[in-house]
Amino acid sequence: MSRSNRQKEYKCGDLVFAKMKGYPHWPARIDEMPEAAVKSTANKYQVFFFGTHETAFLGPKDLFPYEESKEKFGKPNKRKGFSEGLWEIENNPTVKASGYQSSQKKSCVEEPEPEPEAAEGDGDKKGNAEGSSDEEGKLVIDEPAKEKNEKGALKRRAGDLLEDSPKRPKEAENPEGEEKEAATLEVERPLPMEVEKNSTPSEPGSGRGPPQEEEEEEDEEEEATKEDAEAPGIRDHESL
């Protein structure tokens, strides 16, 4: 882009690509203006990441206007949640995480009535992703599936999400979990472990569907380091 991104000011509801270390520029929305009274977030916007429904505080230098940057950053990406994010920013830009409750004064998300509690195990958790982890560093970069052929095939296309499931650990189910989960969805609270354990993957599967009976193998990415905690809330989970 020709002009410097640093001077750009955003307002509530603006659509952007947000950059966090170790991650591609991610489709996002400005949800809250900087709150000068809060030192840690002064000059930082709270952004909502499409696809994963996580939030983080980012400065303007890490934000890029969506329409202007769409061609540059809007290319398909293997990261879990990225494809869903591209879809949501185009088709459902006002989407909110289930059970979302704003805890800050300058929120621009209209909340006429509280949304229903999060679906049990829906995984649309919100936390202050900036430098936080969920107490065991689970916000890690997901591993892209190996491409088996040129046309090919990242697994996990819709309609093929439950293929090849022997690797998948069975999540504990918590019939009572909905209310507890909804209570943890405040903007700045780190994810408590019991909620994390009971959650299913944080987003619907993305990527290409498998030619049947193809075995899934995954490569680790080089960037899977401590930077991972600064991710847009994308949980690494094994392929379903």
Epitope: W87, A118, A119, D122, K151, A153, G159, P204, R208, G209
Partner: antibody
Framework: QITLKQSGPGIVQPSQPVRLTCTFS??????????VAWIRQPSGKGLEWLAT???????RYNPSLKSRLAVSKDTSNNQAFLNIITVETADTAIYYC????????????WGQGTLVTVSA | DIQMTQTTSSLSASLGDRVTISCRAS??????LNWYQQKPDGTVKLLIY???RLHSGVPSRFSGSGSGTDYSLTISNLEPDDIATYYC????????FGGGTKLEIK
């Protein structure tokens, strides 16, 4: 704005082939991640998924109908096709096409449906 | 194949009621569940995707929840425009619809 419109022969004789056309606008079947699904609904009954054609031709069929169905597309004219190789009276139904993403977010936009009646 | 069962084929409710429609899968579908609304004129709309995410333009009185094999759609304040048949659909392994639940006004 995304729109889809189905068209077909209306009435067809048993054991004949049928070709249904879905003409759409607002998206392209050459775009990565895009698909068109075909769904039908016999009178007074529920929805039944038939087939999905993806942008890369890695298509999917309902196993119970697979031997009688074929999907294809004409990306330049924004059309998708459902071919039923030999129709039976049980194929009488309203046929819908719907836009789908491989991003697993459902059949996002649907056509209005076209009635196919199989009758001698 | 994954079977989807909507045990209630029809239900009557009054305007303003809170209505819950349930759906059960024959196996764990990991939240890969959508809800659709079909109006009497045949028009079909996606309401909720991935168990609980509201599709664009859908009123917030609609909500979805569930996990594993059991899912539900709730309409919190029934309006005349909600008269329709509601279908659940799994997309974990191919696509399968439930049999539908027809919602009528008392």
């Amino acid at each position: 704005q995304i729109t889809l419109k189905q068209s077909g022969p209306g009435i067809v004789q048993p054991s004949q082939p049928v070709r249904l056309t879905c003409t759409f606008s607002g998206f392209s079947l050459s775009t990565s991640g895009i698909g068109v699904a075909w769904i039908r609904q016999p009178s007074g009954k529920g929805l039944e998924w038939l087939a999905t054609i993806w942008w890369d031709d890695d298509n999917r069929y309902n196993p119970s109908l697979k031997s009688r169905l074929a999907v294809s597309k004409d990306t330049s004219n924004n059309q998708a096709f459902l071919n039923i190789i030999t129709v039976e009276t049980a194929d009488t139904a309203i046929y819908y096409c719907a836009q789908i993403y491989d991003y697993a977010v459902g059949f996002a936009y649907w056509g209005q449906g076209t009635l196919v009646t199989v009758s001698a | 194949d994954i079977q989807m069962t909507q045990t209630t084929s029809s239900l009557s409710a009054s305007l303003g009621d809170r209505v819950t429609i349930s759906c059960r899968a024959s196996q764990d579908i990991s939240n890969y569940l959508n809800w659709y609304q079909q109006k009497p004129d045949g028009t079909v709309k996606l309401l909720i995707y991935y168990t609980s995410r509201l599709h664009s333009g859908v009123p917030s009185r609609f909500s979805g929840s569930g996990s594993g094999t059991d899912y539900s759609l709730t309409i919190s304040n029934l309006e005349p425009d909600d008269i329709a048949t509601y279908y659940c659909q799994q997309y974990g392994k191919l696509w399968t619809f439930g049999g539908g639940t027809k919602l009528e006004i008392k």
